[in-house]
């Protein structure tokens, strides 16, 4: 009975060639989603002008396939039980998913002058960048197509800096014909507890980011984890989007198309300010910003985008502290749609459901220099997007799994 | 105290080419700005280019339609300025100055000044 | 390119008394103004930096005021050792601009 399962189980869920686990892990069978709300600021000029809070109204969803790519350069590593992998990034926009078309128009922060005023805080190198930004007539606040914003574009200011910059700009620019990776992780042969656990990230076992234990590459990639997943466990994964690992811990049961599953959700803990939870101390990597390490909900992450002011957060501030939000009108933040979750079938520990929630904010702060900038008396963390990718197991697959799996338990 | 020592000035005539040096004393040199400011004749007081702390951004105004080239040796603690296509209006005492705006003194532009070199383009 | 119209051209004026020197901008240079400070055979001294901050060591009898447009640079008691040229300095935006200088002798 059990014993059996448990062997089999053991077998399949390995990540070798042959087994259900591989096929499904090389490319995966679930169509995923990535949802795009994009932050439209209703009042640039009053902002620019008068420092007045920004009042954003959310537009979308613009819907994306995205995932649908097989894996890349799988090697399997049989000295150290490991197979390594590039997943490539794709992204095909889905008309009939969204509430318009790439060609939309969205009134955002310049990410180009806002990034450049943080990344180049020197009085005269602000003055040179002011001269460059006014003769190319950009302001605080751009008008972008979607595709524009989400997939990059030349900037007229960058165009004009006669040294070597990037002059192409978007949110996740670059992203198709890009790959993330390369990922070793374990292929379970050896030890099944340690299936889909990475061994390492482009070549590390640390991202080089943060301090102490927060810099470490923890657990799978979430889209499974090793099997006979108890609910008292706290699943550790890590996100490339984030920049960090996180952790996920169960909150209720749930019936998914006939499967029993355990929800997941990352808990408001995990947001906290290291005065909430001192766990989070080396998450907090300057002291400016984050009044001292008390905000808490917002997760800068420049030193891992080139020092660009990007902070990560989730959907409408949610489990935001009242100083982040407190410069932005027009946010609701509201638990059921703005959480992440993740539904695990426990026996296999495969990730059947999920919904992977996150929102893309830019820092622009006063600069004496830099004209545009000038007039602002504070610090804002703008809201530019924030995304839903969610995946669900198909009606087949589900049937399948019904079958093979939670049929032969019960 | 803040030393600057400028040098290379001299007469030459209209179309020739000229390279003044600036030498400090200070071991910072390498994490502060730059600048050249020259006094005409007329007593006006101008600035000729400048440069950051590493060298990568610099600027001229347009005046000075892109004859002159400033540059930096951090290692030798030493600011240069290449002449070149000089005029009788480039007439001037060339100073190298220093921005102090370090340690949160914002805007602190030409804190400190070398005692100057002179140029004199005639025929 | 933003000017500067510094005046007047030279002033007399008598130990003890109260100067002042006047920079309009063509342009609008919130307060981005700096006062310099020559005196024959030496190089330019830097008195007072943008937001109207004096410098260490600058004696509080030299101050300024402004905003926008219109700035004052003011010596409370003249001394002697004030004698020199003084030139105004629009740091706002490239190219930097400087007054045409205001000569400062003694009646």
């Known amino acids: 009975g059990d014993m059996l399962i448990q062997k089999t189980i053991k077998k399949e869920v390995v990540l070798e060639e042959g087994t259900i686990a591989f096929k499904n892990w090389v490319k995966t069978g679930t169509e995923i989603y990535r949802q795009f709300w994009i932050f439209d600021v209703q009042n640039p000029q009053e902002v620019m002008m008068n420092s007045s809070n920004i009042q954003v109204k959310q537009r979308g969803p613009y819907t994306y396939r995205v995932r649908f790519l097989a894996k890349e350069n799988i090697t399997q590593d049989p000295k150290d039980n490991t197979v390594s992998f590039l997943q490539p990034n794709g992204a095909i926009f889905e008309p009939s998913l969204s509430v318009g078309t790439e060609a939309d128009n969205f009134t955002v922060l310049n990410l180009a002058v806002a990034a450049a005023s943080h990344i180049y805080p020197n009085p005269f190198v602000q003055v040179v960048l002011n001269s460059l930004i006014n003769k190319s007539k950009s302001s605080m606040f751009q008008v972008r197509t979607l595709r524009e914003l989400l997939w990059g574009y030349t900037d007229p200011f960058l165009s004009l800096v006669p040294y070597p910059v990037s002059t192409r700009v978007g949110m996740f620019y670059p992203y198709n014909n890009t790959a993330d990776g390369v990922y070793k992780v374990f292929n379970g042969k050896d030890s099944i507890s340690k299936v889909a656990i990475i061994d390492t990230y482009k070549g590390k076992r640390n991202l080089s980011y943060w301090e102490s234990y927060c810099d470490m590459i923890n657990g799978t990639d979430a889209a499974s984890f090793p099997p006979f997943v108890e609910k008292s466990q706290v699943l550790q994964f890590f996100s490339s989007d984030i920049c960090r690992s996180i952790y996920a811990v169960f909150e209720s049961d749930v019936n998914l198309k006939g499967i029993p599953v355990y929800r997941f959700v990352l808990p408001s803990k995990a947001f906290a300010s290291p005065v909430q939870n001192p766990d989070n101390h080396c998450f907090c990597t300057e002291k400016i910003i984050s009044k001292n390490c008390t905000s808490y909900g917002v997760l800068d992450i420049s030193k891992c985008k080139e020092g660009k002011p990007v902070y990560i957060s989730l959907p409408h501030f949610l489990y935001a502290s009242p100083d982040v939000s407190e410069t932005i009108d027009g946010l609701n933040p509201n638990e059921e749609e703005h959480r992440t979750y993740l539904d695990i079938e426990p026996i296999t520990g495969f990730t059947l459901q999920f919904a992977k929630r996150l929102q893309v904010n830019l820092l622009v702060k006063p600069s004496n220099k830099i004209q545009v900038l000038k007039r602002l008396k504070r610090n804002y963390i703008v809201p530019i997007l924030w995304l839903n990718e969610t995946g669900t197991i198909g009606d087949e697959k589900a049937k399948m799994f019904r079958s093979q799996v939670t049929g032969k338990i019960n | 105290e803040v030393q600057l020592v400028e040098s290379g000035g001299g007469l030459v005539q209209p179309g020739e080419s000229l390279k003044l040096s600036c030498e400090s004393n200070e071991y910072e040199f390498p994490s502060h700005d730059m600048s050249w400011v020259r006094k005409t004749p007329e007593k006006r007081l101008e600035l000729v280019a400048a440069i950051n702390s590493d060298g990568g951004y610099t600027y001229y105004p347009d005046t000075m339609e892109r004859r002159f080239i400033i540059s930096r040796d951090n290692t030798k603690k030493t600011l240069y300025l290449q002449m070149s296509s000089l005029r009788s209006e480039d007439t001037a005492l060339y100073y190298c100055?220093?921005?102090?705006?370090?340690?949160?003194?914002?805007?602190?532009?030409?804190?400190?000044w070398g005692q100057g070199t002179l140029v004199t383009v005639s025929a | 390119e933003t000017t500067v119209t510094q005046s007047p051209a030279s002033l007399s004026m008598a130990i003890g008394e109260k100067v002042t020197i006047r920079c309009i901008t063509s342009?609008?240079?919130?307060?981005?103004m700096n006062w310099y400070q020559q005196k024959p055979g030496e190089p330019p001294k830097l008195l007072i930096s943008?937001?109207?901050t004096l410098r260490p060591g600058v004696p509080s009898r030299f101050s300024s005021t402004g905003y926008g447009t219109d700035f004052v640079f003011s010596i409370e008691n003249m001394l002697s050792e004030d004698v020199a040229d003084y030139y105004c300095l629009q740091s706002d935006n490239l190219p930097f601009t400087f007054g045409s200088g205001t000569k400062l002798e003694i009646k």
């Open positions: 943008e937001g109207n």
């Open positions: 100055a220093r921005h102090g705006y370090d340690y949160d003194e914002e805007g602190a532009w030409f804190a400190y």
């Open positions: 342009t609008d240079i919130d307060d981005d």
